[in-house]
Every structure is written in C-alpha cells, then in structure tokens.
Amino acid sequence: KAMHVAQPAVVLANSRGTASFVCEYASPGKATEVRVTVLRQADSQVTEVCAATYMMGNELTFLDDSICTGTSSGNQVNLTIQGLRAMDTGLYICKVELMYPPPYYMGIGNGTQIYVIDPEPCPDSD
C-alpha cells in the first residue's frame, strides 16, 4: 500500500498572510529520519515551496530563507507558511519520505487548499 498522508482540505490564511496546517502520516515502520516537502499545485503546475529533513524527536530545520516553519510530534508535522499573498492561493500538498532506516517509504497528501485574501489598505485619516 501507499503510505497514507492526511492533511486538512481547506485552510484560510490570517490577515498577516500566515497559514498553518497539520500533515499526518501513517508510518509503516520505525523511521528515524523523515523528509517533509510542501508542494504547491496550481493549474497543473507544481512547484516546491519548502522542504526539511528531521530526525524523529528533533525540530524541523528549514533553510534560513524559507517561508516555512514547523514542529514535529510523533507522526504529525505542524507546518506554518508565512508571507502569503492572494496570488499564492492554491493547493498545498504535503509529501513525506521515510529516509532511514530502509526500506524507503513515500506518501503524498491530497493537499490543503489555502485561501489568501490581501487585507484592504487602511483609509487615509484627515
């Protein structure tokens, strides 16, 4: 069977352009090293948003310039994406790979539709 990865269907970013969701995977074995990748799918185009490899029980480490942060707890990864704008609305897909020990397993979630609404500019005060 494919490794099952679950994530919420819909999330609304807050007024600061931040969206959070949980990516949960059903691990077939006792993985110690896990790689999580967030992919954005829009109009059949797929781009990588961010990725992190972590050791079970340790924090996720994204690149310094990444728009993602996250924490892990067991087979759950809590992901936060920052700096989103209306044009970033799309399907954000969680891809999980169990890197070590062998055998390798991989699963892909069905995606979280993230809606981003740009805030209205404040009216000028006289």
Partner: nanobody, 126 residues
C-alpha cells in the same frame, strides 16, 4: 517494500528499436503514475514518458513524440516503453519511477515521483 525492476536496455544502431520493461512489486493502489526517465552524466534526470494507472493518460517529452510509446499491462504489473527510430542523443541510463498519487494530483509531475528502479543503460551507436 516497493520494487521497480527495469530490463531491455542494450546497444542498438541508429534507427533501431528497443523495448524497455518495468516490473513493479510491493505496491498496491488503484491510482499511481509510472514514468520512464533518463539521465546521462552531464544532465539532470528528465522525464521521457509517463502513464497514469487509471484512465491511461500519457505524457511524452517533445524529443521522443512519435518515436516512443508507453503502455502498461496491469495484470503483470509491468509498464513498457517501445523505442523506435533511436538516435545517438537517446543514449542514457533509463530509470522507471513510480508516483503514489491520487486523482487530485497533476498528471505525471516529476515532483510526485519517489520510488525508482536501478536503471537500464541504452546506447545508440554505430
């Protein structure tokens, strides 16, 4: 444990034909993409052709359209790549890849592939 085993590579003269096979085991799902990719030492791995298990949607690289044909035999869990009118530029190691997707995922997108075979070498030379 998912395993993909390629066969059928070899040395062929320009204008000749080969048929590659990819046998899949250890994976059971109604939905997946299986693709053929190739790589030579100077280049990144590129998708040559791909087929979706359900519905049979196919995708081809522009460089092989009209020359290569992908097909599948679900009963044998095997995917084939018929390569005709081979050119020296087709020389590479050919890999079979599997993407454990669902209907929401874009057809045959390289980001969704995670399981790979060991590769079979194709050499086109006179």
């Amino acid at each position: 444990q998912v395993q993909l085993v390629e066969s059928g590579g070899g040395l062929v003269q320009p204008g000749g034909s080969l048929r590659l096979s990819c046998a899949v085991s250890g994976f059971s799902s109604d939905y997946y993409d299986i693709g053929w990719f190739r790589q030579d030492p100077e280049k990144e791995r590129e998708m040559v052709s791909c087929i979706r298990s359900s519905g049979g949607s196919t995708k081809y690289a522009d460089s092989v359209k009209g020359r290569f044909t992908i097909s599948r035999d679900n009963a044998k869990n095997t995917v084939y790549l018929q390569m005709n009118s081979l050119e020296p530029e087709d020389t590479a190691v050919y890999y079979c890849g599997l993407a454990p997707i669902s209907p929401v995922h874009a057809v045959c997108n390289q980001h969704y592939f995670g399981y790979w075979g060991q590769g079979t070498r194709v050499t086109v030379s006179s």
